[in-house]
Amino acid sequence: EQKLISEEDLAAKKVVLGKKGDTVELTCNASQKKNTQFHWKNSNQIKILGIQGLFLTKGPSKLSDRADSRKSLWDQGCFSMIIKNLKIEDSDTYICEVENKKEEVELLVFGLTANSDTHLLEGQSLTLTLESPPGSSPSVKCRSPGGKNIQGGRTISVPQLERQDSGTWTCTVSQDQKTVEFKIDIVVLAFQKASSTVYKKEGEQVEFSFPLAFTLEKLTGSGELWWQAERASSSKSWITFDLKNKEVSVKRVTQDPKLQMGKKLPLHLTLPQALPQYAGSGNLTLALEAKTGKLHQEVNLVVMRATQFQENLTCEVWGPTSPKLTLSLKLENKGATVSKQAKAVWVLNPEAGMWQCLLSDSGQVLLESNIKVVPTWPTPVQP
């Protein structure tokens, strides 16, 4: 015979926050550590599960196939209800009836998802949407891998993703002074560097590398390197290539310069010789399959040439150099130096010896070329 439960037997309602898809355990403890009769019901008084003799029985609720209890803890007076694969609509007040007592637990289930693919191109926007039960008023706070904090309500927006936003975002949902934490992995599709500069002496081999800031098991797309030589009026496509499952295959390459490209990642190009006519800047673009937009990396080539012609020793650089860079000519082991914040320096009638041409940035040498000046003897006067 069932006894009536008075209002004073109703314990204070607990609030438990759960995550969509996760498992939650709603606890219910009897005062005596022994196996006794208990029931879990929802707010509509529909039985979910309970005990009949020594067996767990299930009621006609929608939760019946996802609800369970830890039978091993019944002897200790613990009659918890475990709900697997939580859904937002599982949010409800659940009542545990045990020893003529009612324990109420309010379960609030939240879900946090990215509105689009979690693999996004640098510069694209990320929107996180919170699914929450009706009547709740949660707040959300997200922290990016780089330590950026963003707050919001039902939605959180990051207008322009940067490469340092790649990684695990930790989002905390708060409701009734309780919190639940979500972790969302975001991959920002970008090159490791936005721009790089290669400094070379004339005639040296040039290597350009374009490492990606992410790894994908299957990486497919196509790319192209456009080059704007300093001496040229328009840019030119130097190479086009395909990428399939991380394998690079060249489609078309210009005849001058004759570039070589590695067949595996990271993308790597070799220019046989650094020549003044190649100095300039390039833009490598990579379009990935099933992604709108392209990845970009800028690459600059600065070429140095030191020459001696008659009584003039000249050092020149071509390519994109900043105005603060210094170009100098100095005689080894001697004080003789000429320096300029320019693209060419020269010495008339240079002393014999080993001269160094240096391109430097605040004292740091970026490029160096040596040239030997041999003594010039006066031409004997013909009788």
Partner: antibody, heavy 119, light 107 residues
Framework: EVQLLESGGGLVQPGGSLRLSCAAS????????MSWVRQAPGKGLEWVSG????????YYADSVKGRFTISRDKSKNTLYLQMNSLRAEDTAVYYC????????????WGKGTTVTVSS | AIQMTQSPSSLSAFVGDRVTITCRAS??????LGWYQQKPGKAPKLLIY???SLQSGVPSRFSGSGSGTDFTLTISSLQPEDFATYYC?????????FGQGTKLEIK
């Protein structure tokens, strides 16, 4: 156990044709790049031809371009080398080799099959 | 095609010696280089891939180094079974190219 077994070698006259086969077992054949490498008597190794795993692109050494064709039958787990317009200098032991994951070297080799081009 | 220049072409050494073989590429190939050992009448065997990674099952006395254009294979202490011919192979791009080989003989 990963294994490669070449067959199809033999004696052929200059200008003749021959098809080499390489039966693969013990790995997902379609996922890996494969190559043919040859070694003339008393000489060093020479890479002849390759086929990529994912794209199926084919590549050749200049010495065989236009005469040799590499192909693979994924259903039979077999790699082929069709050799036409054979010359005396094509006489060699032909090895079939599998490349490692992400092109980490030719990690498995067959025992080789001998091709002799002579009149 | 990329040229691979291997040196020396032959080498005599004692058991226990430390031996170094070098390989130079005609252009920068990053670390896309492998080292192979071949014994008479046998198929080549991969020792080192990606310039310095030791292939599974290969003794640790074998090591590789280098990047760009210059590469080295070192055998720290020669064992009788190490006397063979060694080849480098660039797999930076197609067509792949082998070095001419280094025949390592017992003194």
């Amino acid at each position: 156990e990963v294994q490669l077994l070449e067959s199809g070698g033999g004696l052929v006259q200059p200008g003749g044709s021959l098809r080499l086969s390489c039966a693969a077992s013990g790995f997902t054949f379609s996922s890996y790049a494969m190559s043919w490498v040859r070694q003339a008597p008393g000489k060093g190794l020479e890479w002849v031809s390759g086929i990529s795993g994912s794209v199926g692109s084919t590549y050749y050494a200049d010495s065989v371009k236009g005469r040799f064709t590499i192909s693979r039958d994924k259903s039979k787990n077999t790699l082929y080398l069709q050799m036409n317009s054979l010359r005396a200098e094509d006489t060699a032991v032909y090895y079939c080799a599998k490349e490692g994951y992400d092109w980490s070297g030719m990690d498995v080799w067959g025992k080789g099959t001998t091709v002799t081009v002579s009149s | 095609a990329i040229q691979m220049t291997q040196s020396p072409s032959s080498l005599s050494a004692f058991v226990g010696d430390r031996v170094t073989i070098t390989c130079r590429a005609s252009q920068g190939i990053r670390n896309d280089l492998g080292w192979y050992q071949q014994k008479p009448g046998k198929a080549p065997k991969l020792l080192i891939y990606a310039a310095s990674s030791l292939q599974s099952g290969v003794p640790s006395r074998f090591s590789g180094s280098g990047s760009g254009t210059d590469f080295t294979l070192t055998i720290s202490s020669l064992q009788p079974e190490d006397f063979a011919t060694y080849y480098c192979l660039q797999d930076y791009n197609y067509p792949y190219t082998f070095g001419q080989g280094t025949k390592l003989e017992i003194k």
